[in-house]
């Protein structure tokens, strides 16, 4: 789709006469009729297949024509067309005298014609004007012309439709050849895909607008390369999402069990030495002369029978000393070494005695590990998800989050690209390894059958007697340009032989 523009510049008719040589009274009130048609080796009358236009009276006898002249006319004259520009044309410009105000052809006498010029040739689409001057014995016409594409049409023959946009469906402007040019920050075939913040993690991050980096569940930070610990985690970190790896001094599945009670709570009194002894438990080693769990009580040597669990008390200069039986320790033999009786195994692990009860070992159920079965096994280490799927540890199982185009428990199945009916105008979709392919019906082309292509009305060779055939792209019909000696819509009749 485009416009043939004709700019009239100057008309000279010094003697003020008609084509017949008869003078105009009082002068030649001149207007123009323009006919644009398909290329003809010899320009002949007939339909103005590319369009026609008339001007109002522009002047008398000799005059210059101003741009955008007043009186309802436009200069340059516009001859719009809604087909692919063929690159060739024929142009007829007639100058007429208007005795009255009615400029319709039927209202004018045939001898009101002042002059008629006809040209033909090649003309490429472009912004540059072609200047021309046509002279007859009595008149001279100076004009220029060009063909430009209509808004949103591009290419050598104005056949490519491209409308710039900046919305959900695309972010682009149009290049002179009609190809898309993505706005900064956008990419993809239709410039719908934002370019994320530089460095944004390819799997863990995504974006909905340029220079953004949004994290998928379980990830955080500017580039989505830092994990988020488990919801219930208290004093732990992670190396993959939803983990809970305990900080120093903390234990348990959610790192909520204090293994460093001494440092955190300083429970031992009177200068006693504190020793951590498991979850939320501690041992105070009292200085001489003190006793009690927290060494809060003063002691009178062995008189108070301080040694427990069968320990024997020995008096010393600076207090006393307990000799503990096997399996016990502490200042007063008050602590037994940790054994299965202390239920040290988490998450249903079973305890086995070792060294005659002096120590133990935990046998862990599936999905748990660690010396106390306190750690959850990461089921994603075997990379079970196919086709770039993302593995997520979720509850008692693992799950695969599939990339677009894949489905199945392990993302092992390819989703048909044709499921979305991507082919326009009744095109047939074919699933291929490399993507999809559309087979287009007659009159359409392009990757998705989105481009309308003109039907070639000349394909059936409708013109006789070596006539030249042209397709009228506005109506998808043919026009026959007859050689000398033949007439008719198909040039089927010799001149002088009327149709029977």
């Amino acid at each position: 789709s485009g416009v043939f523009q004709l700019q009239l510049q100057e008309f000279v008719n010094e003697r003020g006469v008609l084509a017949s040589g008869r003078p105009c009274e009082p002068g030649c009130r001149t207007f123009f009729r323009v006919c644009l048609k398909h290329f003809q080796a010899v320009v002949s009358p007939g339909p103005c297949t590319f369009g026609s236009v008339s001007t109002p009276v522009l002047g008398t006898n000799s005059f210059a024509v101003r741009d955008d002249s007043s009186g309802g006319g436009r200069n340059p004259l516009q001859l719009p067309f809604n087909f692919t520009w063929p690159g060739t044309f024929s142009l007829i410009i007639e100058a007429w005298h208007a005795p009255g105000d009615d400029l319709r052809p039927e209202a004018l006498p045939p001898d009101a014609l002042i002059s008629k010029i006809a040209i033909q040739g090649s003309l490429a689409v472009g912004q540059n004007w072609l200047l021309d001057e046509q002279t007859s014995t009595l008149t001279r016409l100076r004009y220029s012309y060009r063909v430009i594409c209509s808004d949103n049409y591009y290419g050598d023959n104005c056949s490519r439709l491209c409308k710039k946009r900046n919305d959900h469906f695309g972010h682009y402007v149009c290049q002179p050849d009609g190809n898309l040019s993505c706005l900064p920050g956008w990419t993809g075939e239709y410039c719908q895909q934002p370019i994320c913040l530089s460095g944004c993690h390819e799997q863990n991050g995504y974006c909905s607008k340029p220079a953004e980096c949004l994290c998928r569940p379980g990830w955080q930070g500017r580039l989505c390369n830092e994990c988020i610990p488990h919801n219930g985690c208290r004093h732990g970190t992670c190396s993959t999402p939803w983990q809970c790896t305990c900080d120093e001094g903390w234990g348990g599945l959610f790192c909520d069990q204090d293994l460093n009670y001494c440092t955190h709570h300083s429970p031992c009194k009177n200068g006693a030495t504190c020793s951590n002894s498991g979850q939320r438990s501690y041992t105070c080693t009292c200085r001489p002369g003190y006793t009690g769990v927290d060494c809060e009580l003063e002691l009178s040597e062995c008189d108070s029978n301080p040694c427990r669990n069968g320990g024997s008390c020995k008096d010393q200069e600076d207090g006393y000393h307990c000799l503990c039986p096997p399996g016990y320790y502490g200042l007063h033999c008050e602590h037994s070494t940790l054994s299965c009786a202390d239920s040290p195994c988490f998450n249903g692990g079973s305890c086995r005695e070792r060294n005659q009860g002096a120590s133990y070992a935990c046998e862990c159920p599936p999905n748990f590990t660690g010396s106390n079965c306190e750690k959850k096994v990461d089921r994603c280490t075997s990379n079970p998800c196919a086709n770039g799927g993302q593995c997520l540890n979720r509850g008692p199982s693992r799950m695969c989050r599939c990339r677009p185009g894949f489905t199945g428990t392990y993302c092992e199945r390819h989703v048909s690209d044709c499921a979305r009916n991507p082919c326009a105008h009744g095109g047939t979709c074919h699933d291929l390894e490399s993507g999809l392919m559309c087979t287009c019906p007659a009159g359409f082309s392009g990757r998705r059958c989105e481009v309308r292509t003109s039907i070639d009305a000349c394909a059936s060779s409708p013109c006789f007697n070596r006539a030249t055939c042209y397709t009228d792209l506005s109506t998808d019909t043919f026009v026959c340009n007859c050689p000398y000696g033949f007439v008719g819509s198909r040039c089927e009749f010799p001149v002088g032989l009327p149709p029977s």
């Epitope: 949004l214 994290c215 569940p217 955080q220 930070g221 830092e226 919801n231």
Partner: antibody, heavy 118, light 107 residues
Framework: EVQLVESGGGLVQPGGSLRLSCAAS????????MAWVRQAPGKGLEWVAT????????YYRDSVKGRFTISRDNAKNSLYLQMNSLRAEDTAVYYC???????????WGQGTLVTVSS | DIQMTQSPSSLSASVGDRVTITCRAS??????LAWYQQKPGKAPKLLIF???DLADGVPSRFSGSGSGTDFTLTISSLQPEDFATYYC?????????FGQGTKLEIK
């Protein structure tokens, strides 16, 4: 026990400013992303802002962008929300919560009421 | 933004009843959905995350199911302390969004 205690709420005129604080305890504050979530009187819950634990990256809902600033001080186990150019529609109970925009909000404070009115 | 629609908006039930609340997302959110319980004048409390995982200390009468766009919270046998407002929340897409809430009242 995890505890989140908000403070700093009150009555403020439209266009005014307020700074909310949240004191955290019972967990290693520096290890976890934090958020503010609000609830207008008689209405539902609405996420306001988030800050990561790793590098302090911040995110805001569109209606508060440029007016509110979320920040944290790991040494003080504290989360903050600086609210400027307050509007009547910002009136709500503001909750401090542990979580990111892409994770559940596992623990919540008791909330502090912010009333914007002339 | 993803729209989260809860139904019903309010619900009357008796102690011992089995109750189901549904939540629908305007687009696929995989299993990235949480449920919260809120009592008047109190802060919300996380009940369920990742659609079906119970948060620490939540009774087993609460359960969650679904994936994609349709999710449900079920309370198998209502207890007096369960009367409250329940909210669903998606955290699959930015920004996180909540449902409008379902108020569970005593019949």
């Amino acid at each position: 026990e995890v505890q989140l205690v908000e403070s700093g709420g009150g009555l403020v005129q439209p266009g005014g400013s307020l700074r909310l604080s949240c004191a955290a305890s019972g967990f290693t504050f520096s290890n976890f992303p934090m958020a503010w979530v609000r609830q207008a009187p008689g209405k539902g819950l609405e996420w306001v802002a988030t800050i990561s634990s790793s590098d302090g990256t911040t995110y805001y809902r569109d209606s508060v962008k440029g007016r509110f600033t979320i920040s944290r001080d790991n040494a003080k186990n504290s989360l903050y929300l600086q609210m400027n150019s307050l509007r009547a529609e910002d009136t709500a109970v503001y909750y401090c919560a542990r979580g990111y925009y892409n994770s559940p909000f596992a623990y919540w404070g008791q909330g502090t009421l912010v009333t914007v009115s002339s | 933004d993803i729209q989260m629609t809860q139904s019903p908006s309010s619900l009357s039930a008796s102690v011992g009843d089995r109750v189901t609340i549904t939540c629908r997302a305007s687009q696929d959110i995989y299993i990235n959905l949480a449920w919260y319980q809120q009592k008047p004048g109190k802060a919300p409390k996380l009940l369920i995350f990742d659609t079906s995982d119970l948060a620490d200390g939540v009774p087993s009468r609460f359960s969650g199911s679904g994936s994609g766009t349709d999710f449900t919270l079920t309370i198998s046998s209502l207890q007096p302390e369960d009367f409250a407002t329940y909210y669903c929340q998606q955290y699959d897409y930015y920004p996180p969004t909540f449902g409008q809430g379902t108020k569970l009242e005593i019949k």
